[in-house]
């Protein structure tokens, strides 16, 4: 069956400053790919997070992703600001050249809220 | 006080197409997402069918697909389903959901409105 | 789609006795589990969210616990007014949205 990519969450409130997590798991680790997470649709979207190698400032990985059986690729934003007010998606892509998205989660609406 | 109120269930032949509705009142109805729950008489509960608050996003059972409409009229805080081609199983008392507004679970639920199908 | 299988069908008690449901998932809902009262006439009503969460107004005799795929709604002394059919609801995976068949608690 096709891989799907669950966000549990329709929307997280977080005040400015403070850390949220947003969650995401994977119902298969099949096909091999990378998954990536965006705020935005489009081709406009950023990219928050990469589970590879990359560092990205104030963006965690909740579990270890690097663990074979690991299905959970939830992210945790720290001190987060107005402007990483949002929809974030997790998305899975298929390996390739280039890599090919194939599944994405519903989104999670990101408020942020004054101190 | 949130509340919801279903009408335009009714005996209708099989077939034939019917449309309910929901007013709602008591909360920002656009915020929120809405979804029509159904229950056969005697059995469970069935979802069939959600629309985001903004109308964006629709999704419905399998059962119903391609056969029932959902729509919404935020300017009236009210809530439709178009039901055509109606068969004996859809014969049901269809309830109004109102969503959490973070997870998809039902805060509010109207009283319902019986649906018969039956020729 | 989640299927959600809720036992017993039917749990025959007294007032005052406690009252242990299932809800068995067929795939991990970590923690994403409603639980609803409806009594014969009525509409459902909201429990128990967040498989241990009570919902406002729910009175501490009734608790949730539970997750993965094993859950349990316990009423730790039956009221006259307990005496209804529960049921389950998913909200992990997006829709389709699934409830469990349902247990009728009713009175011995």
């Known amino acids: 069956t096709e891989v799907k990519v669950i966000q549990p969450e329709k929307s997280v409130s977080v005040a400015a400053g403070d850390s949220t997590v947003l969650n995401c798991t994977l119902t298969s680790l099949l096909p091999v790919g990378p998954i990536r997470w965006y705020r935005g649709v489009g081709q406009s979207r950023q990219l928050i997070y990469s589970f590879t190698t990359e560092h990205f400032p104030r963006v965690t990985n909740v579990s270890d992703a690097t663990k074979r059986s690991n299905l959970d690729f939830s992210i945790r934003i720290s001190n987060v600001t107005p402007e990483d007010a949002g929809t974030y998606y997790c998305v899975k892509f298929q390996r390739g050249s280039p890599d090919t998205e194939i599944q994405s989660g519903g989104g999670t609406e990101v408020y942020v809220l004054a101190k | 006080e949130v509340q919801l109120v279903e009408s335009g269930g009714g005996v209708v032949q099989p077939g034939r197409s019917l449309r309910l509705s929901c007013a709602a009142s008591?909360?920002?109805?656009?915020?929120?997402?809405v979804n029509w729950v159904r229950q056969a008489p005697g059995k469970g509960l069935e979802w069939v069918s959600l629309i985001s608050g903004s109308g964006e996003i629709i999704y419905y059972a399998d059962s119903v697909k391609g056969r029932f409409t959902i729509s919404r009229d935020n300017s009236k805080n009210t809530l439709y389903l178009q039901m055509n081609s109606l068969r004996a199983e859809d014969t049901a008392v269809y309830y109004c959901?109102?969503?959490?507004?973070?997870?998809?679970?039902?805060?509010?639920w109207g009283q319902g409105t019986l649906v018969t199908v039956s020729s | 789609e989640i299927v959600l299988t809720q036992s017993p069908g039917t749990l025959t008690l007294s007032p005052g006795e406690r009252a242990t449901l299932s809800c068995r998932a067929s795939?991990?809902?970590?923690?994403?589990l409603a639980w609803y009262q409806q009594k014969p006439g009525q509409a459902p009503r909201l429990l128990i969210y967040g498989a241990s969460s009570r919902a406002t107004g729910i009175p501490d005799r009734f608790s949730g616990s539970g997750s993965g795929t094993e859950f349990t709604l316990t009423i730790s002394s039956l009221q006259s007014e307990d005496f209804a059919v529960y049921y389950c609801q998913q909200y992990y995976d997006r829709p389709p949205l699934t409830f469990g068949g349902g247990t009728k608690v009713e009175i011995k």
């Open positions: 795939q991990s809902v970590y923690t994403y």
């Open positions: 008591g909360f920002t109805f656009s915020s929120y997402d």
């Open positions: 959901a109102k969503e959490n507004n973070r997870y998809r679970f039902f805060d509010d």
